[in-house]
Interface confidence: low
């Protein structure tokens, strides 16, 4: 037959342990009930009475089953560069994360301690690596045949358009300008949100297919002189 179910408080068997959601009280030398999340121990157990739990006060919390005498204080309100992604409740701490356009430069156990604005790549530079929740944008100079004319933390270098006749050759910070006749489109017109139609690179840069290997297909990679050094990253 199974052993009789013990109700808290009770003395554990010699060398035994207390059950789930119970703790061993050294003073009473008994197994006593823990308090559920959102509560704390108002009165500790004795040999004859179990733990008395009480709700956490405003702006305090307990996230786990516990026997703490006081609830933990919620973290301070989120700063202006943060958004509150989890509110302070009796059962969970406030969590602040960086708002869009920012990343976490110094994290803490939950959420972020210090946010920093994502780097913006200046004209002539494109985003080489996107910013993430915990890392900054990396900028790189636009390769020959590509350009970026914006200061942006999201824009990447885009190919110059192809012209029947080039009025002004493109450079790292400007698209090619065509004469009044429409530019040639060997590919589909660009996305409507872009200031210039995106196509392949300008005529004056001969695109060369990278060596193809099954099953990968490469993009057209430009050849030609490198642009003058303009610094490794944009600000």
């Amino acid at each position: 037959l199974p052993a009789q179910v013990a109700f808290t408080p009770y003395a554990p068997e010699p060398g035994g342990t207390c059950r789930l959601r119970e703790y061993y009280d050294q003073t009473a030398q008994m197994c006593c009930s823990k308090c559920p999340p959102g509560q704390h121990a108002k009165v500790f157990c004795t040999k004859t009475s179990d733990t008395v739990c009480d709700s956490c006060e405003d702006s305090t919390y307990t996230q786990l089953w516990n026997w703490v005498p006081e609830c933990l204080s919620c973290g301070s309100r989120c700063s202006s560069d943060q958004v509150e992604t989890q509110a302070c409740t009796r059962e969970q701490n406030r969590i602040c994360t960086c708002r869009p356009g920012w990343y976490c430069a110094l994290s803490k156990q939950e959420g972020c301690r210090l946010c920093a604005q994502l780097r913006k790549c200046r004209p002539g530079f494109g985003v080489a690596r996107p910013g993430t929740e915990t890392s900054d944008v990396v900028c790189k100079p636009c390769a020959p045949g590509t350009f970026s004319n914006t200061t942006s933390s999201t824009d990447i270098c885009r190919p110059h358009q192809i012209c029947h006749v080039v009025a002004i050759p493109g450079n790292a910070s400007m698209d090619a300008v065509c004469t009044s006749t429409s530019p040639t489109r060997s590919m589909a017109p660009g996305a409507v949100h872009l200031p210039q139609p995106v196509s392949t690179r300008s005529q004056h840069t001969q695109p060369t297919p990278a060596p193809s290997t099954a099953p990968g297909t490469s993009f057209l990679l430009p050849v030609g002189p490198s642009p003058p050094a303009e610094g490794s990253t944009g600000d």
């Epitope: 990396v138 590509t146 990447i156």
Partner: antibody
């Protein structure tokens, strides 16, 4: 000629860890990033992690606690380790080169290595 | 995470027919990328920066869209175009893929 070749154990027992190597040729890991992408049988693609040319990493947050990526530039190898495998981790695992010319695409892919999680 | 929803998940087209498949993002992305995958093969880059064809991709393919709505179009379906097409975004990590559109030949 750009090539990527994955190699792995094939069969992994549940709760065990997985180690896969991607050996590349035709380009340098100091100039290009490498991604890991997986595809369960009959299902779609899931991006896992990338190690960038400078050694920086970006993980899929849903799997970050179980994933680890590293590389040896001199050996032209990228390593993926995944812990606590379950049956739903059974998939084809691909490594792919990150097109670092600013187009943000995986321009060359390996053939993939099949990983089966089973006891 | 940005969720990419592709529709339809399965479609069939006759040779010569015009085909359009869409990719809808749960929040705005700057550009969309497309990959083609055939059975027992690795994915291949197909369209980058929303509308640019990867080398070797036939001119009958085109891509367009902005914000949360993107599409891939084949002006005239050919047998070799039967494959699964995946969209992908790089605007926010994790760099998610769509669930794919499987295009079959009628």
């Amino acid at each position: 000629e750009v090539q990527l070749q994955e190699s792995g154990p094939g069969l992994v027992a549940p709760s065990q860890s997985l180690s896969i190597t991607c050996t590349v040729s035709g380009f340098s890991l100091t100039s290009y990033g490498v991604h890991w992408v997986r595809q369960p049988p009959g299902k779609g693609l899931e991006w896992l992690v990338v190690i960038w040319s400078d050694g920086g990493t970006t993980y899929n947050s849903a799997l970050k606690s179980r994933l680890s990526i590293s590389k040896d530039n001199s050996k032209s190898q990228v390593f993926l380790k995944m812990n606590s495998l379950q049956t739903d981790d059974t998939a084809m695992y691909y490594c792919a080169r990150h097109d670092d010319d600013g187009y943000y695409a995986m321009d060359y892919w390996g053939q993939g290595t099949t990983v089966t999680v089973s006891s | 995470d940005i969720v990419l929803t592709q529709s339809p998940s399965l479609m069939s087209a006759s040779p010569g027919e015009k085909v359009t498949m869409t990719c809808s993002a749960s929040s705005s992305v700057g550009y969309m990328y497309w990959y083609q995958q055939k059975p027992r093969s690795s994915p291949k880059p197909w369209i980058y920066l929303t509308s640019n064809l990867a080398s070797g991709v036939p001119a009958r393919f085109s891509g367009s869209g902005s914000g949360t709505s993107y599409s891939l179009t084949i002006s005239s379906m050919e047998v070799e175009d039967a494959a699964t097409y995946y969209c992908q975004q790089w605007s926010s990590d994790p760099f998610t893929f769509g669930s794919g559109t499987k295009l079959e030949i009628k």
